[in-house]
């Protein structure tokens, strides 16, 4: 028998520095977790102790903190090179700055192979990108070889900006011939490494003949065997075992997100490359693991530019940006409108001639808006200003919901109106009218939504049975502020871009902003 140790990360999302337990900015260093310096300590410890070790990343290193905003992927290549990653799969967020924003900082600078079997380049891009990422990579490990085959969510064109010259094929259809090719090369130990979410990971394990292990990402899935060491609740055991259609037991793993854990999986293979056994658990990278001093020093060196960036002007406002709780928790506020407009703008994807855009709606809990911005400072808006408005380090995500779920969400928005509670919704692409004289749960008297399948966008009444795409904070997608109906009833959830980054990009693009209160949220007469 031959033993392989797979160390894996996914959805690190720009958490190069250590973070607090909830993956936001580290405040009390003695309680902080993750970060590349701490990750390196643990990886090196395992490499020294065990003979056959691979360090793999399942995508979405890009996007999530000011590190990505400033360094645009150069930081990913630099620190992944330093940690000596063996391979990475492309995630949807690797395309956030377009194909050029992937090629120049990452594909050309990474010293490790970057993989995806289901992304095919066409047109002028084909020759430019040829060879910069691969469908698979064969890695020598000890006296053996291991094949790593990559895959990426086929939803990427709706979630990011890959442009028109990349085709995202069905994962299973694309993976099978590549695995077959590896078999013809006498590679009999094959890991599928990719970024399509836990459900697809399990399907790949079931359907793709010859895949021995699946290492996934995208869904931030936490798996654990035994008592979990932190706040994350396991979605299943680690590894999660899938019985393939040809009768094999295939381990599937994922390691939550944000570099908080290092996935640790030990696989035993027989001489024919069959998995005999698999066991392990994610390792919580808490403060009991010291940060590597040389990587930490490098982080501190790179940090300097971030501090300078946060005080630079992004754009100007010529109006007061009312982000006060007195406004945003009670009525339409122009800061809410600004943020929602930025959220929609960030999700413009012209992928179909029938639709002007795939999504037109935004909802945002008023309690998530934490500060106003005064225009009387020469109108200047900085990253620092926006960090005061959106201090939680969240993301603006894409969900699919039925109209009936949206109606429940808007009822929840005003179910205890008047108490300055955070669930009051700010909106974009939605016109809502409330009658507060009615009983809670029956206060929404009009709910119109902006059409997407139209050349001239207009507002139509919400249909209860129709499925709608909505952009909202991850906090709401996860049922925060009592929006349990969103969490329970959502049909799809894809994590999006860092909240501050979305708004800062929009302000930089617009240069001068003047958001108004324009009647998106109304109260019917006699009740307000």
């Amino acid at each position: 028998a031959w033993e392989l140790t797979i160390l894996h990360t996914n959805d690190v999302h720009s958490r190069l520095e250590q973070t607090s337990e909830d993956s936001s900015k580290c405040v009390n260093a003695s309680r902080c977790m993750g970060g590349v310096a701490r990750l390196f300590t643990k990886v090196q410890q395992i490499r020294r102790a065990e003979p056959n070790v691979l360090l793999l990343d399942a995508g979405d290193q890009y996007q999530g903190t000011i590190w990505f905003t400033v360094y645009k992927g150069a930081e990913v290549a630099h620190f992944m090179n330093a940690l000596r990653y063996d391979a990475m799969a492309l995630g949807n967020h690797e395309f956030d700055n377009g194909v050029e924003g992937l090629i120049e900082p990452l594909l050309k600078e990474a010293k490790f192979p970057i993989l995806s079997a289901n992304i095919k380049a066409k047109g002028p891009l084909a020759s430019q990108i040829s060879g910069l990422y691969l469908p698979y990579k064969v890695l020598p490990v000890g006296d053996e070889v291991v094949g790593i085959v990559g895959y990426t969510s086929k939803e990427t064109p709706f979630l990011s900006n890959p442009g028109t010259n990349l085709v995202f094929e069905d994962e299973i259809t694309a993976l099978q011939p590549e695995v077959d090719k590896l078999k013809t090369l006498n590679v009999n130990k094959i890991i599928a490494l990719g970024h399509s979410g836990f459900e697809m990971d399990k399907l790949i394990a079931q359907k793709v003949r010859g895949v021995d292990v699946v290492v996934g990402g995208h869904s931030n899935t936490f798996l654990y065997t035994g008592n979990p060491p932190s706040k994350e609740v396991p979605a299943g055991k680690y590894p999660f075992i899938v019985t393939s259609d040809d009768g094999r037991k295939v381990p599937v793993v994922q390691a939550y997100a944000f570099g908080k854990y290092l996935g640790y999986l030990k696989i035993e293979f027989d001489e024919r490359g069959n998995v005999i056994s698999s066991h392990g658990n994610p390792i919580l990278l808490n403060s009991s693991i010291p940060e590597d001093p040389s990587i930490k020093a490098d982080i501190n060196k790179w940090r300097i530019k971030l501090d300078n960036y946060s005080t630079q002007e992004l754009g100007k406002t010529i109006v007061y940006l009312d982000g006060s709780s007195q406004s945003c928790r009670f009525r339409e506020c122009n800061m809410g409108n600004l943020i929602c407009d930025a959220m929609i703008n960030n999700n413009l994807r012209h992928t179909d001639e029938m639709f002007w855009n795939h999504v037109s709606m935004c909802i945002l809990n008023g309690g998530g808006i934490r500060s106003p911005i005064d225009e009387r400072n020469n109108g200047t808006i900085t990253w620092e200003n926006l960090a005061a408005v959106l201090p939680f380090g969240g993301t603006f995500d894409l969900v699919q919901l039925k109209g009936s779920t949206l109606k429940k969400a808007f009822e929840h928005s005003v179910h205890r109106y008047g108490q300055s509670t955070g669930e009051f919704l700010q909106v974009g692409g939605i016109h809502v009218v409330y009658d507060l004289s009615r009983k809670p749960g029956d206060r929404v008297v009009k709910l119109d939504v902006l059409c997407t399948k139209c050349r001239v966008p207009s507002y139509d009444p919400l249909k209860m049975d129709e499925v709608y795409k909505v952009i909202l904070p991850n906090f709401l997608a996860n049922g925060g502020d009592g929006f349990q109906m969103i969490k329970d009833e959502l049909l799809r959830h894809d994590s999006g871009d860092q909240d501050i980054n979305v708004v800062s990009t929009y302000i930089s693009k617009m240069k001068v902003i003047y958001p108004a209160v324009e009647g998106r949220i109304k109260f019917s007469t006699g009740s307000h």
Partner: nanobody, 126 residues
Framework: EVQLVESGGGLVQAGGSLRLSCVVS????????MGWFRQAPGKEREFVAV????????YYADSVKGRFTISRDNAKNTVYLQMNSLKPEDTAVYYC???????????????????WGQGTQVTVSS
Amino acid sequence: EVQLVESGGGLVQAGGSLRLSCVVSGRTFSNYHMGWFRQAPGKEREFVAVIGRSGGPTYYADSVKGRFTISRDNAKNTVYLQMNSLKPEDTAVYYCAGDWRNSDSPSKLKPVYDYWGQGTQVTVSS
């Protein structure tokens, strides 16, 4: 676009010498482990020599040890194979290959190589 272009092949008498070159474009050359492989008519492609990305270590097939020398010039994006004391059994198409991997140990194993040139013919007459 990643491209590998070999040159320097030809017809030579037994006991003679040839120097093969392979120029790599499209990506930072110093990140590749570079190998030479050969394929004689009707035979499998086989390992000849390999050199690590920073100029070492080097490994050779037993059949060429002491006769062939692999080297690289990272400034010129080029890997060389100096072939001395050539024998008729060295007749083959010679391919250069690149292995993009974040490790200091080059590999002799053919499946590990992702990038291949078109090959250059070497014929050794007796």
